[in-house]
């Protein structure tokens, strides 16, 4: 015998209180597959979360973060405070990058400036709290009679991680 519940499509549930007929999901709930005996309650985007995609009878709501915050974790499970470029988030809030480190994004940690000498190059543009150093040609390339220097690549623009 076929399970009568298997005929219930997504967006409905097999209602034991009504002789296993297919009932529509109650408000603010959904079933994304057929044959379900309950509908799942929709995620509520509250607090620092805001609704990115409304719940429907067949799919859950999706959240992102209110301005000044960014998503962390799969499915935007948490919202973390944004900081300015040149800062990182600590337990005590946003703090400026220490000398010798930089952060060119509104999230993440301060990273050490590139050590140009490790690649045998010189510092063309000094680093700041917001930007990495720009390494230029090696000191040997700057000796008299050396071939012309290719202009350095511009410093990276702030990255935008996918949410």
């Amino acid at each position: 015998l076929q399970d009568p519940c298997s005929n219930c499509p997504a967006g409905t549930f097999c209602d034991n209180n009504r002789n296993q007929i297919c009932s529509p999901c109650p408000p603010n709930s959904f079933s994304s597959a057929g044959g379900q005996r309950t509908c799942d309650i929709c995620r509520q985007c509250k607090g620092v979360f805001r609704t990115r995609k409304e719940c429907s009878s067949t799919s859950n709501a999706e959240c992102d973060c209110t301005p000044g915050f960014h998503c962390l974790g799969a499915g935007c499970s948490m919202c973390e405070q944004d900081c300015k470029q040149g800062q990182e988030l600590t337990k005590k809030g946003c703090k400026d990058c220490c000398f010798g480190t930089f952060n060119d994004q509104k999230r993440g940690i301060c990273r050490p400036w590139t050590n140009c000498s490790l690649d045998g190059k010189s510092v063309l543009v000094n680093g700041t709290k917001e930007r990495d150093v720009v390494c230029g040609p090696s000191p040997a390339d700057l000796s008299p009679g050396a071939s012309s220097v290719t202009p350095p690549a511009p410093a990276r623009e702030p990255g935008h991680s996918p949410q």
Epitope: I41, Q44, K46, G75, S77
Partner: antibody, heavy 118, light 112 residues
Framework: QVQLQESGPGLVKPSETLSLTCTVS????????WSWIRQPPGKGLEWIGY???????NYNPSLKSRVTISVDTSKNQFSLKLSSVTAADTAVYYC????????????WGQGTLVTVSS | EIVMTQSPLSLPVTPGEPASISCRSS???????????LDWYLQKPGQSPQLLIY???NRASGVPDRFSGSGSGTDFTLKISRVEAEDVGVYYC?????????FGQGTKLEIK
């Protein structure tokens, strides 16, 4: 349908660490939040904390210094550790699926009684 | 944290008669999205709690329609239109607006 099953020692000595595991069957742990809730004998319900499958956690401030919740998606399990237990931690411990990160516990385990005693 | 207060704590009811449980929160549970973030649970003797009502007034799928939730802001009510023997147990309201979610003390419904 989603089912949750708690497992772990029923007796823990004072000052030791309580460790419980919740196994999720009939659905993937890789969505939703997953909570631990406890109920001392004859008393009401207290939320302990939740974890999202990606590892994000949130704990009740009253227990935060003693609680760790972790997840193992490969085993479809999440776990509770509560350190430095006392007799006041004696309770039935429930795991539950949390629809919104601190709201609407739609699916519950059957609960497991943990007694703290020497 | 938000404090939840239920009344009465004990509720003897005759089968077939209606029953009503009150729940009050220490701050409004009405969020800007228009929903009241309040749940009702029933814990039958020897069992885990089960969700009856979410967002103040929405019956969870599979919950008999004799159960209804109402109210807004800080004052909420769970009504059972006709109590049946299987409805005995402890009823809890829970606020789901802020973490930590917090429960009321519980209302024990018993059959007269």
């Amino acid at each position: 349908q989603v089912q949750l099953q708690e497992s772990g020692p029923g007796l823990v000595k004072p000052s030791e660490t309580l460790s419980l595991t919740c196994t999720v069957s009939g659905g993937s742990i890789s969505s939703y939040y997953w909570s631990w809730i406890r109920q001392p004998p004859g008393k009401g319900l207290e939320w302990i904390g939740y974890i999202y499958y990606s590892g994000s956690t949130n704990y009740n401030p009253s227990l935060k210094s003693r609680v760790t919740i972790s997840v193992d998606t490969s085993k479809n399990q999440f776990s509770l550790k509560l350190s430095s237990v006392t007799a006041a931690d004696t309770a039935v411990y429930y795991c539950a699926r949390d629809q919104s990160g601190g709201g609407s516990f739609q699916h519950w385990g059957q609960g497991t009684l943990v007694t703290v005693s020497s | 944290e938000i404090v939840m207060t239920q009344s009465p704590l004990s509720l003897p009811v005759t089968p077939g008669e209606p029953a009503s449980i009150s729940c009050r929160s220490s701050q409004s549970l009405l969020y800007s999205n228009g929903y009241n973030h309040l749940d009702w649970y029933l814990q039958k003797p020897g069992q885990s709690p089960q969700l009856l009502i979410y967002l103040g007034s929405n019956r969870a799928s599979g919950v008999p329609d004799r159960f209804s939730g109402s109210g807004s802001g800080t004052d909420f009510t769970l009504k059972i239109s006709r109590v049946e023997a299987e409805d005995v147990g402890v009823y809890y309201c829970m606020q789901a607006l802020q973490t930590p979610p917090t429960f009321g003390q519980g209302t024990k419904l018993e059959i007269k």
